[in-house]
């Protein structure tokens, strides 16, 4: 099988740029989703965000986030998600396990799922950026 070593030194500043881009795109997605009136956030859905037992940027649950956003893309044709997925793939290791998402079938519940996950994704990217910048500050002190 394919075991060639890959030499790749990625400065933390570059990772930060990816997360900044994701943060900006998450706000665009949320703004788009919030245009749908009369939809309430649900307590039934939780987007995995940061793992406490890993260092930034590997503490971001990128594979799971990708799976949730891919589900939204299938439920509602939001083209910004394509770009979000491309940037998440910069953080996802090529052998990361797949995440299965149970998709709501009811139309209104689908809308609640989309709003809830979009909101959590936006909050998650804010947290991820904070964890990156605080990690960088700790590394320099």
């Amino acid at each position: 099988s394919h075991t060639l070593p890959v030499r790749l030194l990625r400065p933390s500043d570059d990772v930060q740029k990816i997360v900044e881009e994701l943060q900006s795109l998450s706000k665009m997605l949320l703004k788009d989703v919030e245009e749908e009136k009369g939809v309430l956030v649900s307590q039934n859905y939780t987007l995995p965000c940061l793992s406490p037992d890993a260092q930034p940027p590997n503490n971001i649950h990128s594979p799971a986030i990708r799976a949730y956003l891919k589900t939204i893309r299938q439920l509602d044709n939001k083209s910004v998600i394509d770009e979000i997925i491309e940037h998440l793939d910069k953080l996802i290791f090529q052998d990361a396990p797949e995440t299965n998402i149970s998709v709501p079938t009811d139309t209104h519940e689908c809308k609640r799922f989309i709003l809830t996950i979009s909101q959590q994704f936006s909050e998650c990217m804010d947290l991820a950026l904070k964890s990156l910048t605080s990690g960088a500050q700790q590394a320099t002190t």
């Epitope: 099988s1 891919k70 491309e86 290791f93």
Partner: antibody, heavy 122, light 107 residues
Framework: QVQLVQSGAEVKKPGSSVKVSCKAS????????MQWVRQAPGQGLEWMGA????????RYSQKFKGRVTITADKSTSTAYMELSSLRSEDTAVYYC???????????????WGQGTTVTVSS | AIQMTQSPSSLSASVGDRVTITCRAS??????LAWYQQKPGKVPKLLIY???TSASGVPSRFSGSRSGTDYTLTISSLQPEDVATYYC?????????FGGGTKVEIK
Amino acid sequence: QVQLVQSGAEVKKPGSSVKVSCKASGYTRTRYWMQWVRQAPGQGLEWMGAIYPAEGDTRYSQKFKGRVTITADKSTSTAYMELSSLRSEDTAVYYCAFPEGPYAAPYGMHYWGQGTTVTVSS
Amino acid sequence: AIQMTQSPSSLSASVGDRVTITCRASRNIHNYLAWYQQKPGKVPKLLIYYAKTSASGVPSRFSGSRSGTDYTLTISSLQPEDVATYYCQHFWKTPWTFGGGTKVEIK
């Protein structure tokens, strides 16, 4: 070692379609983007599109949107690029390319197919 | 789409010369850039990825660097076997466009 083997040369009539295959072997990764690139005689490299075979997710160049379809068969590790409504300007060598690297997103395309020459002529 | 402007389109230099080729991105691509070498009638070969990391088996005379949105491929001492066309390609977001290419010849 990753190997990409493409289908053989094709001669097509204007208005018809062509489907080029690219069979990959020698890798274990599941998360990756494979790209398709073409090169007209004496011209530069032109990006056509990409596929994420694990999910069949695709991205296309605006120039080819509506005319190109990229698919993948996970069971045979084969990607396909179909170009429709062919015209003489589509005469080119078509390449598939595959990345190395620790992440799902590519940094560069380390492995290339041998190229498939497509000639469009009446 | 992000545009990649490559210069010069062609150059002629003597064996042993230092050669530089530049690609300018129309927006910040944060090192997501690769350089390829293509010899006449051959398949493109990856030289540099992630702006400055050498691909396996690439001679040390090839190197990549970055200044802002300008990315440079340098051949420190041109060899006869380096006669080829060189292309850059970005991977920041699709479409992953290529530069127009630089044809390198020996004087």
